[in-house]
């Protein structure tokens, strides 16, 4: 009886693992083995596929074959018993195009209200992704073990921290990799769960802001308790993107190492042009807080996005506010060469109730004020470009009294 060729050959490539699966064409024939040949583009001769010779099952692994993953190859299979079937040719394919990204490795660290996620490619020193290793981004799904309500987080790098979690709570997550340059989305990792720790005695500092004064950066933050010391650290933002790179060394800022106030001032030349991450930690001598949320700090934007300068003309029922270019040291105006939007906050001096106006124009009317009343105003600038999405700090508050009633000019 003539042996039939095997059919329906599938090539599965995950990272550097090359697996072939096929169907037996004739289940009734026993003791059949299968063998594969391969052919590279531009070659006439077929070569025996090592790892896939005289296979008794319907699956084989040819990962040991050192292929150029960007080069098209062809496969053929036949069945063998006393005689052999005819060859069945598989459609040619390029390994890189066919390859899927495997599940990444995930390691978790718990804080009281945060989880640190360390992600690395599932295959170390992968041949398949050798040219793309730096381009991996990751996405994850996280949920509270008790509720199962999922939250998705996209476009993260090999080290990511999730904040604003609840203490002593079990969270579960799974992660997958993507190579956006090649339109490849990977396979999810197994689910990893971790319980956040008991709430720390000292909370982390909050609301970190960077501003520029003269030739210095001023870093400010909020803290719940008094009599604390703080330290500030920085990291090059690009180091976060290096997959599997443990070069994740936070560095100190010389003038912010053991400060007793909720701000520190350091020269602009501490940082070269670039994007940095900053974080702050509090200590009372015995206990230390966890690190604050990391803020992104872009020297190019930060250096020039200064709080606006404004003049107020007071009327009986309104203020006219004229916004000018901010001044640098030496009283020279700063040229801001990107479109800005202004946020103006005003309040009655005796009240805490703030009102807000958002305006693109540099002359703004604040209406509906009471005569002979002191109002305070502060303003900040925002970039209108979504990609930049930066804000200046608020200007110092300026307080003015409205004119008596019936004043129209």
């Amino acid at each position: 009886k003539n042996l039939k060729s095997p059919q329906k050959v599938e090539v599965d490539i995950i990272d550097d693992n090359f697996i072939l699966r096929w169907n037996r064409s004739d289940e009734s024939v026993g003791n059949v083995t299968f063998s594969f040949d391969y052919q590279k583009t531009g070659m006439d001769n077929w070569i025996k596929l090592s790892g896939c010779q005289n296979i008794t099952s319907t699956k084989c692994n040819f990962s040991s074959l050192k292929l150029n993953v960007y080069e098209e190859i062809k496969l053929r299979i036949r069945a063998e018993k006393e005689n052999t079937s005819s060859w069945y040719e598989v459609d040619s394919f390029t390994p890189f195009r066919k390859a899927q990204i495997g599940p990444p490795e995930v390691h978790l660290e718990a804080e009281d209200k945060a989880i640190v996620i360390h992600i690395s490619p599932g295959t170390k020193d992968s041949v398949m992704w050798a040219l793309d290793g730096l381009s991996f981004t990751y996405s994850l799904v996280i949920w509270k073990n008790s509720s199962g309500v999922e939250e998705r987080i996209e476009n993260i790098y090999s080290r990511h921290k999730i904040y604003k979690l609840s203490p002593e709570t079990t969270y579960c997550l799974k992660v997958k990799a993507a190579l956006l340059t090649s339109w490849k989305i990977g396979v999810y990792s197994p689910v990893h769960c971790i319980k956040t720790t008991v709430e720390n005695e000292l909370p982390p500092p909050e609301n970190i802001e960077v501003s520029v004064q003269n030739q210095n950066y001023v870093l400010k933050w909020d803290y719940t308790y008094a009599n604390m010391t703080f330290q500030v650290q920085w990291l090059h933002a690009f180091l976060k993107r290096n997959p599997g790179n443990h070069l994740y060394k936070w560095k100190q800022i010389p003038d912010c190492e053991n400060v007793k106030t909720t701000q520190c001032v350091f020269p602009q030349n501490v940082f070269q042009k670039g994007i940095y991450l900053l974080r702050v930690q509090a200590s009372d001598g015995n206990n230390t807080s966890f690190w604050s949320e990391e803020i992104k700090f872009d020297t190019e934007i930060q250096a020039f996005l200064l709080p606006p300068v404004f003049n107020i003309r007071s009327l009986s029922d309104s203020f006219h506010i004229y916004i000018g270019a901010p001044k640098q040291s030496g009283n020279t105006p700063v040229i801001q060469d990107y479109p800005l939007i202004y946020e103006i906050i005003f309040w009655e001096n005796t009240s805490n109730a703030e009102r807000k106006i958002i305006e693109k124009k540099t002359d703004v009317t604040v209406p509906n004020l009471k005569p002979l009343t002191v109002y305070c105003v502060k303003a900040r600038a925002h970039t209108m470009d979504e990609k930049l999405n930066k804000s200046s700090v608020f200007s110092d508050a300026v307080c003015e009294k409205t004119k008596p009633g019936n004043t129209s000019k």
């Epitope: 730096l134 090059h236 690009f238 180091l239 290096n242 790179n245 070069l247 060394k249 070269q272």
Partner: antibody, heavy 118, light 107 residues
Framework: QVQLQQWGAGLLKPSETLSLTCAVY????????WSWIRQPPGKGLEWIGE???????NYNPSLKSRVTISVDTSKNQFSLNLTSVTAADTAVYYC????????????WGQGTLVTVSS | AIQLTQSPSSLSASVGDRVTITCRAT??????LVWYQQKPGKAPELLIY???GLGSGVPSRFSGSGSGTDFTLTISSLQPEDFATYYC?????????FGQGTKLEIK
């Protein structure tokens, strides 16, 4: 001002183990990464590896199978061991401190010439 | 590992000359590049960090520029004490690597 003082055997036979120690004087030992770097005669610099106070290490993969860097916090010292040396390991070996303010080596030892010869 | 290639490997110049040395990385290292000066029998000394930051106590005639894969060290007006060997080094990823060096000699 921090000073790095290094010492160790200067002449070894092939297959022996190179051992060098670097002592840190006049400065903090914590919060810093401490490296070993070598320079074969008339050639360029090669980073060997580093250690931090906790004992956590990173090594150059080209030497990883033969290298151990260890730390003795009580003496403010760190050490380099390189096993199975050959003539190719002949070099001036430097200990160095990576700045805590930035990504660069800001203090270096005086260097120790280690010669491997039968 | 990231490889750094310096050019030229050696050059001759005179006091007062403007000199430029380049360093090229095999992959993007952003600004994680350092320049050192080494004199015979001495350990290297920091000149430039983060591609363009001037090291403490380093004369302002030294400057660095570049980001990504191409970097430059410039000495605006050579002084007698500047004749030495110069190395670039990357801190972007492990293992740290150095360029092969550029030897600057008196013409």
């Amino acid at each position: 001002q921090v000073q790095l003082q290094q010492w160790g055997a200067g002449l070894l036979k092939p297959s022996e183990t190179l051992s060098l120690t670097c002592a840190v004087y006049g400065g903090s030992f914590s919060n810093y990464y401490w490296s070993w770097i070598r320079q074969p005669p008339g050639k360029g610099l090669e980073w060997i590896g580093e250690i931090i106070l906790s004992g956590s290490t990173n090594y150059n993969p080209s030497l990883k199978s033969r290298v151990t860097i260890s730390v003795d916090t009580s003496k403010n010292q760190f050490s380099l061991n390189l096993t199975s040396v050959t003539a190719a390991d002949t070099a001036v070996y430097y200990c160095a401190r990576e700045s805590k303010w930035g990504y660069y080596f800001d203090s270096w030892g005086q260097g120790t010439l280690v010669t491997v010869s039968s | 590992a990231i490889q750094l290639t310096q050019s030229p490997s050696s050059l001759s110049a005179s006091v007062g000359d403007r000199v430029t040395i380049t360093c090229r990385a095999t992959q993007d290292i952003s600004i994680a590049l350092v320049w050192y000066q080494q004199k015979p029998g001495k350990a290297p000394e920091l000149l430039i960090y983060d591609a363009s930051g001037l090291g403490s106590g380093v004369p302002s005639r030294f400057s660095g520029s570049g980001s990504g894969t191409d970097f430059t060290l410039t000495i605006s007006s050579l002084q007698p004490e500047d004749f030495a060997t110069y190395y670039c080094q990357q801190f972007n990823s492990y293992p740290y690597t150095f360029g092969q060096g550029t030897k600057l000699e008196i013409k």
